[in-house]
């Protein structure tokens, strides 16, 4: 039938950060090509990445249409140069992906401290509100727009002279913390979605320390 050397894809894996979502699979193709289809549980299949020799397919455009939906993808294998050929049952070989719900499963990207400002013994730390590829009314939504109060940030802060890290939490993008006068502090933030069961935390932001250019100091 011309499919004797065609193998089904395997190890289908979703790789997703801040809703940028790619489906990866194996094996690297030898004399075969792949096409990917994606669907919601109740929707129709949509084909993407037609007859590709890649082992990944960017499905971001599809999943951002409704990040709270659950998606299923499948990868079809075709003989190279003979994509009309089918398997023994009259269908091309294919393998299903695990289900994927972007809102619950996309990894939280590394946050960035936008700025910090000291006024006396208070420091205001602001986290950058990262833009996602989720659109509403033709504009890209930020992470906060998408997750709302489900998204919190944990601030780790410590005196430059010590290692113990105090914590603070916010469900905005700003922290207001008390600091000791005359001490320099360092800061790092972590995004958290407490309502999740998996992928609850982001990696920590790069560390920012007082006395460096991102910060501002005002004595009152």
């Amino acid at each position: 039938s011309g499919t004797t050397n065609t193998v089904a894809a395997y190890n289908l894996t979703w790789k997703s950060t801040n809703f940028k979502t790619i489906l990866e699979w194996e094996p690297k193709p030898v004399n075969q090509v792949y096409t990917v289809q994606i669907s919601t549980k109740s929707g129709d299949w949509k084909s993407k990445c037609f007859y590709t020799t890649d082992t990944e397919c960017d499905l971001t455009d599809e999943i951002v249409k409704d990040v709270k939906q659950t998606y299923l993808a499948r990868v079809f294998s075709y003989p190279a140069g003979n994509v009309e050929s089918t398997g023994s049952a009259g269908e091309p070989l294919y393998e299903n992906s695990p289900e994927f719900t972007p809102y619950l499963e996309t990894n939280l990207g590394q946050p960035t401290i936008q700025s910090f400002e000291q006024v006396g013994t208070k420091v205001n730390v602001t986290v950058e509100d990262e833009r996602t590829l989720v659109r509403r009314n033709n504009t890209f939504l930020s992470l906060r727009d998408v997750f709302g109060k489900d998204l919190i940030y944990t601030l780790y802060y410590w005196k430059s002279s010590s290692s113990g890290k105090k914590t603070a939490k916010t469900n905005t993008n700003e922290f207001l913390i008390d600091v000791d006068k005359g001490e320099n502090y360092c800061f790092s933030v972590q995004a958290v979605i407490p309502s999740r069961t998996v992928n609850r935390k982001s990696t920590d932001s790069p560390v920012e320390c007082m006395g460096q250019e991102k910060g501002e100091f005002r004595e009152i």
Epitope: I152, K165, K166, A168, T170, K201, D204
Partner: antibody
Framework: EVQLVESGGGLVQPGGSLRLSCAAS????????IHWVRQAPGKGLEWVGY????????YYADSVKGRFTISADTSKNTAYLQMNSLRAEDTAVYYC??????????????WGQGTLVTVSS | DIQMTQSPSSLSASVGDRVTITCRAS??????VAWYQQKPGKAPKLLIY???FLYSGVPSRFSGSRSGTDFTLTISSLQPEDFATYYC?????????FGQGTKVEIK
């Protein structure tokens, strides 16, 4: 089923060391925060310190700073409390507890059964 | 550090009584207060979180409230299994701190 099981307590001489373990099951340690709390005989609860197993961040109560170290082995899903230079006043039942958030408010929903540490000559 | 001043330190009550325990924070802690119940030889158990939310599986006779920096745990009708020690805890700032505890005894 979520569970925290402590072990490693016992009798130790002043100045000695002990390592307590807190083995977690039913959840992945890295998704949460682990606190250690102690309770001296007939007394109230005293916070000892915490670890974020995801990034290794720690902080300690002044009473144990420089003597106690909290760590985690994520491959074993276990947190540890290394106690050095032990004093009689460290005698207590030691608990580990899992911290989670409701929005920004933290709560400690699961606790270990406790392990008794007695510092005496 | 934030102090949590809990009162009374002990109380005697009868089954069916309404019991109120209070905690005062030394500074603003927003709603970052939890209440725990502890029985002799056992680990503490979470009752109330975020000042007023009843933890899953906890009987509805337990409730929590906040007024500024004052926090209250109320048991509407004391049951035999409620005789225990109760602790408030703030986690608004590091380090988290506990109240001294309130022992609820049988009258």
């Amino acid at each position: 089923e979520v569970q925290l099981v402590e072990s490693g307590g016992g009798l130790v001489q002043p100045g000695g060391s002990l390592r307590l373990s807190c083995a977690a099951s039913g959840f992945t340690l890295t998704g949460y925060w682990i606190h250690w709390v102690r309770q001296a005989p007939g007394k109230g609860l005293e916070w000892v310190g915490y670890i974020d197993p995801y990034n290794g961040a720690t902080y300690y109560a002044d009473s144990v700073k420089g003597r106690f170290t909290i760590s985690a082995d994520t491959s074993k899903n276990t947190a540890y409390l290394q106690m050095n230079s032990l004093r009689a006043e460290d005698t207590a039942v030691y608990y580990c507890a899992r911290a989670d958030y409701y929005y920004v408010d933290e709560y400690w929903d699961y606790w270990g059964q406790g392990t008794l540490v007695t510092v005496s000559s | 550090d934030i102090q949590m001043t809990q009162s009374p330190s002990s109380l005697s009550a009868s089954v069916g009584d309404r019991v109120t325990i209070t905690c005062r924070a030394s500074q603003d802690v927003n709603t970052a207060v939890a209440w725990y119940q502890q029985k002799p030889g056992k680990a503490p158990k979470l009752l109330i979180y975020s000042a007023s939310f009843l933890y899953s599986g906890v009987p509805s006779r337990f409730s929590g409230s906040r007024s500024g920096t004052d926090f209250t745990l109320t048991i509407s009708s004391l049951q035999p299994e409620d005789f225990a020690t109760y602790y408030c805890q703030q986690h608004y700032t590091t380090p988290p701190t506990f109240g001294q505890g309130t022992k609820v005894e049988i009258k």
